[in-house]
Interface confidence: low
Amino acid sequence: IRAEKAMVDGSWLDLAKRSKLEAQPFAHLTINATDIPSGSHKVSLSSWYHDRGWAKISNMTFSNGKLIVNQDGFYYLYANICFRHHETSGDLATEYLQLMVYVTKTSIKIPSSHTLMKGGSTKYWSGNSEFHFYSINVGGFFKLRSGEEISIEVSNPSLLDPDQDATYFGAFKVRDID
Amino acid sequence: IRAEKAMVDGSWLDLAKRSKLEAQPFAHLTINATDIPSGSHKVSLSSWYHDRGWAKISNMTFSNGKLIVNQDGFYYLYANICFRHHETSGDLATEYLQLMVYVTKTSIKIPSSHTLMKGGSTKYWSGNSEFHFYSINVGGFFKLRSGEEISIEVSNPSLLDPDQDATYFGAFKVRDID
Amino acid sequence: IRAEKAMVDGSWLDLAKRSKLEAQPFAHLTINATDIPSGSHKVSLSSWYHDRGWAKISNMTFSNGKLIVNQDGFYYLYANICFRHHETSGDLATEYLQLMVYVTKTSIKIPSSHTLMKGGSTKYWSGNSEFHFYSINVGGFFKLRSGEEISIEVSNPSLLDPDQDATYFGAFKVRDID
């Protein structure tokens, strides 16, 4: 019976390890600076890295500019968006700016597209200063279903900071849906 | 056999409890106001509390101003940095400020230091207002290896808000590395 | 003995599933726009949704404007607060604003109230621009005991953005207290 117990213990140790390591989904996506849209209008950002530097993804999918959920659950979502301008880049079209981010959820299966989180600020980036910078951070806890897509919209995309430590978004699963 | 089953169940209950409570590493470190550097240059902040008020640490180490990872894993890292100035503190050296935070990762094994996250804003803190305040929040999900160190750099350290609810950073482990 | 082993395995599978799904507490509360206080003074926000749109709560309680902890643990707390003003709403009482959020913890057992996190900015919302916007995000990892209450205080509540994607706060349990 001891051998049997050892076998039970062994199999459970495997299960416990597997369960613990069972790859809770996550993603940390960083801006792809080679393909940032121009202009000052509100756009959806579609070019992100998922596999270089700090960018990583597991049990989620990145496709067509969207982070796709593969596993139902409650996730913590976050985004950090940095805007900057140096006078050497030329004059701004306007000194009064609305620097915004919108984190949206879209489902093709069930018709819906909604903004989960937004943040930002109106700014007066005067010509009196040679450099301007501003960062936005948002985060929240949301129920996500398999097949749903997370995307990022920003205003003034041409002002985005292209560094991987500056402009990124991500998600990690915290718990199952009951 | 029933006693044996009870023993198996009992040992597994312990394991399950241990596994669940198995002290996922975390830290929440608050600024040590008695030792904030002066000046307006960019500096690494080395004085943080880890064991008073809201500050807590478990299965991580705080040493020489750095948060040291003891357990491989994917962690959520965050920082909240508040800057403030009151006219009673005297005039600012300049009214045009760059208030920034950089969350960096250093590895001793592979000598390197990288910025994981940055945030902040350029500000015009005019003499027309007696009080100025600004807060930055950043957060993200990163793979950390045992022995790696997390540190915080800021510009204008003399303007930091010394309250424990204002200037802090932290981390908590979310999942293992596969 | 095989049947006995199967029984042990079966019961443990149940326990493992229950343990995994065991409803770690969380809440995501969104502003109730029908009941936002007026004025520019600092107030506690008491009207939040917990059961519509993105707002959800599980194994925590919302009562009297406060988020009540039902289960001891270490929680990640966060808040996102957006302020806005359009000239069509009339002139601001003052163009120099202090836009702030305070996340506080109150304990009934040990009568006390403490600020866990604060964030915000002083702003100059000049009449030269027809629209102004500003968002604050704060987040941190805290030990919470059953019966403790989390609440949100803001300055200038009349300027709050009433959208569910703009003004919200929440919490999710990450781990037990050892």
């Epitope: 299966k109 069930i110 819906s112 909604h114 279903r145 | - | 993105w54």
Partner: antibody, heavy 117, light 110 residues
Framework: EVQLLESGGGLVQPGGSLRLSCAAS????????MNWVRQAPGKGLEWVSS????????YYADSVKGRFTISRDNSKNTLYLQMNSLRAEDTAVYYC??????????WGQGTLVTVSS | QSVLTQPPSASGTPGQRVTISCTGS?????????VHWYQQLPGTAPKLLIY???WRPSGVPDRFSGSKSGTSASLAISGLRSEDEADYYC??????????FGGGTKLTVL
């Protein structure tokens, strides 16, 4: 307070057309999916059509596909349903419903469409 | 013929507990889509009663509860009251890109 007010219903002959409107207030219309649901006299609820925030996703029930067109004007906070080639079986109370996540959170009071010769 | 099947009628006396079932298929409820319940009082528009299988909107008494398992869902009403007399509809999304409703259940409080 969320309000949805349908209008445009009435009596129409088979083969005729009608345009229903739904005026929305009390929420950010431009951020919300909208829907039409109908209920024939003495019968149950039947979904008719859904439209996304910026009109790039549109869905119809098989029973109305090719005959009905859903549209919206976010600047006017108004939802529309253009109904062509009407049949007797289209007789119903038509409700405008606001989508909140995946459920119909708010409903209008409805407008009656009668198709009869 | 509705895609989701509900009993046409149900009844109970005040104070009793009543359950209404809603049966779908692998292309809707069984595909993992959430089930929502609507209450329609006589002569009025429908009102959301339960969403996402089990969640109650503000103002809905906790006497109403919902659950889902496999290809079925159910609505339970405990402590039945006369004002609960109404038609009840379940609804969910279907892989055919359609919203689908149950045929409705007329609840009578005896």
């Amino acid at each position: 307070e969320v309000q949805l007010l349908e209008s445009g219903g009435g009596l129409v002959q088979p083969g005729g057309s009608l345009r229903l409107s739904c005026a929305a207030s009390g929420f950010t219309f431009s951020n919300t999916w909208m829907n039409w649901v109908r209920q024939a006299p003495g019968k149950g609820l039947e979904w008719v059509s859904s439209i996304s925030v910026n009109s790039n996703y549109i869905y119809y029930a098989d029973s109305v596909k090719g005959r009905f067109t859903i549209s919206r004007d976010n600047s006017k906070n108004t939802l529309y349903l253009q109904m062509n080639s009407l049949r007797a079986e289209d007789t119903a109370v038509y409700y405008c419903a606001r989508d909140s996540e995946y459920a119909f959170q708010n409903w209008g009071q409805g407008t009656l469409v009668t198709v009869s010769s | 013929q509705s895609v989701l099947t509900q009993p046409p009628s149900a009844s109970g006396t005040p104070g009793q507990r009543v359950t209404i079932s809603c049966t779908g298929s692998s292309s809707n409820i069984g595909a993992g889509y959430d089930v929502h319940w609507y209450q329609q009082l006589p002569g009025t528009a429908p009102k959301l009663l339960i969403y996402d299988n089990e969640w109650r909107p503000s103002g809905v008494p906790d006497r109403f509860s919902g659950s889902k398992s496999g290809t079925s869902a159910s609505l339970a009403i405990s402590g039945l009251r006369s004002e609960d007399e109404a038609d009840y509809y379940c609804a969910t999304w279907d892989d055919s890109l359609h919203w689908v409703f149950g045929g409705g259940t007329k609840l009578t409080v005896l």
